[in-house]
């Protein structure tokens, strides 16, 4: 039950995380104009991975796509790549994890196969989450670097009379969405890996032994009471079994809890 819950929760958390990674990747507000110097600007700039936008106080918003591939900064290309890899891995992970879910029966799939699939999807979610976190962090670092560079030469003018105010950019909403989503995907992946351990059939180091009562000296009585016909020194040679204890054979002869849907 706990394994099913862990697996299910891991799947849901990862699903939310991947949806968040997709949302963050598509969002236009990766960087937004810093309003520290002009909090009441009539023109507000913000940028995403795919296009940059300008919102006028008139209410009109104009967005322009980055129609060049070679002209874009290498860091931006790297962030795009990381986010796309994260989405692709996450999507594959989701697909694999659907079939790995304990509550879904597909043909006569073995528990070991489900365990392997759960582990695979878990690893995929972890890598997906790490890609998203890395992508967002690289972009954030790029912003911080550019912010301080533009602050250093914020005002360039002729004789101090005419000022050209350089637009500075700060963290946009997409960065926070990306960090949270990446974290959720990572957590979901870890939960799937934990669930995998519970799904895998336990392998033991000892051989299965079947015990049979030889003669009248051993009696099997359920309920944990020890019973014997003899008293004295010979008792130490007799095999006395707790009714609650089972041999390896007995365990396997019962329907496994993993056989129930």
């Amino acid at each position: 039950m706990a394994v099913t819950a862990c697996q299910g929760l891991g799947f849901v958390v990862s699903l939310i995380g991947i949806a968040g990674i997709i949302a963050a990747t598509c969002m236009d507000q990766w960087s937004t104009q810093d309003l520290y110097n002009n909090p009441v600007t009539a023109v507000f700039n913000y940028q995403g991975l795919w296009r940059s936008c300008v919102r006028e106080s008139s209410g009109f918003t104009e967005c322009r796509g980055y129609f060049t591939l070679l002209g874009l900064p290498a860091m931006l290309q790297a962030v795009r790549a990381l986010m796309i890899v994260g989405i692709v891995l996450g999507a594959i992970g989701l697909l694999v994890s659907i079939f790995a879910l304990k509550c879904i029966r597909i043909g006569s799939m073995e528990d070991s196969a489900k365990a392997n699939m759960t582990l695979t999807s878990g690893i995929m979610f972890i890598v997906s989450g790490l890609c998203a976190i890395a992508g967002v962090s690289v972009f954030a670092n790029m912003l911080v670097t550019n912010f301080w560079m533009s602050t250093a030469n914020m005002y360039t003018g002729m004789g101090g009379m005419v000022q050209t105010v350089q637009t500075r950019y700060t963290f946009g909403a997409a960065l926070f969405v990306g960090w949270v989503a990446g974290g959720l995907t990572l957590i979901g992946g870890v939960m799937m890996c934990i669930a995998c351990r519970g799904l895998a059939p336990e392998e033991t180091n000892y051989k299965a032994v079947s015990y049979h009562a030889s003669g009248h000296s051993v009696a099997y009585k359920p309920g944990g009471f020890k019973a014997s016909t003899g008293f004295g020194s010979n008792t130490k040679n007799k095999k006395i079994y707790d009714g609650g204890a089972r041999t390896e054979d007995e365990v396997q002869s019962y329907p496994s809890k993993h056989d129930y849907v």
Epitope: A42, S58, E62
Partner: antibody, heavy 118, light 113 residues
Framework: EVKLVESGGGLVRPGGSLKVSCAAS????????ISWVRQTPEKRLEWVAT????????YYLDSVKGRFTISRDDAKNTLYLQMSSLRSEDTAMYYC???????????WGQGTSVTVSS | NIMMTQSPSSLTVTAGEKVTMSCKSS????????????LTWYQQKPGQPPKLLIY???TRESGVPDRFTGSGSGTDFTLTISSVQAEDLAVYYC?????????FGAGTKLEIK
């Protein structure tokens, strides 16, 4: 046809209050930001206030901040400018205008005259 | 606040002449996000409210005759009337639409001989 009609202007004593209105027709009023601009007797144009569409965010000229309040009633297609603690320097012709591309006022009303005098 | 300076304050021309008037801002009106200059030109004829002529420094408003041309970038802007007509008698104002407060220039009064 887009039409903006201002009303409510008049003569008021210094320190007094006045509420001017701007009724819009021919436009989806709620979709646009609207501004108030005044023209002094010396013919200088001075932007007074702007109210955005949707969130109704407001912007004011520093000299009117705290004294003037811009508001809108999208259901009535009407813009308001509540003026209080009026001064002689507030004497002007008050125009309302719709903001279009580039934050430019593409449509103007005919204006309403406000005179602050004792 | 961005200061807008217009020159000349007035000019008198004959019909058919080419006219240029200048507008300078104390700060750049060029927005890096879309490479557009947030400068607007208005025309105000006697007894009328101002009328939009040009926005984004060079984009002509629909219905405005093509003899009106806006140019310039950053801090220096120009309005040119290629062949002045009698109906162009008016005061021309430039406005900063980039940063609040949205300041206007003092205007250039165009008179016809």
């Amino acid at each position: 046809e887009v039409k903006l009609v201002e009303s409510g202007g008049g003569l008021v004593r210094p320190g007094g209050s006045l509420k001017v209105s701007c009724a819009a027709s021919g436009i989806t009023f709620s979709r646009y930001a609207i501004s108030w601009v005044r023209q002094t007797p010396e013919k200088r144009l001075e932007w007074v206030a702007t109210i955005s569409s949707g969130d109704s965010y407001t912007y004011y000229l520093d000299s009117v901040k705290g004294r003037f309040t811009i508001s809108r009633d999208d259901a009535k297609n009407t813009l308001y400018l509540q003026m209080s603690s009026l001064r002689s320097e507030d004497t002007a012709m008050y125009y309302c205008g719709r903001l279009g591309y580039g934050n430019a006022m593409d449509y103007w009303g005919q204006g309403t005259s406000v005179t602050v005098s004792s | 606040n961005i200061m807008m300076t217009q020159s000349p304050s007035s000019l008198t021309v004959t019909a058919g002449e080419k006219v240029t008037m200048s507008c300078k801002s104390s700060q750049s009106l060029l927005n890096s996000g879309n490479q557009k200059n947030y400068l607007t030109w208005y025309q105000q004829k006697p007894g009328q409210p101002p009328k939009l002529l040009i926005y984004w420094a060079s984009t002509r408003e629909s219905g405005v005759p093509d003899r009106f041309t806006g140019s310039g970038s950053g801090t220096d802007f120009t309005l040119t009337i290629s062949s002045v007509q009698a109906e162009d008698l008016a005061v021309y104002y430039c406005q900063n639409d980039y940063s609040y407060p949205l300041t206007f220039g003092a205007g250039t009064k165009l008179e016809i001989k």
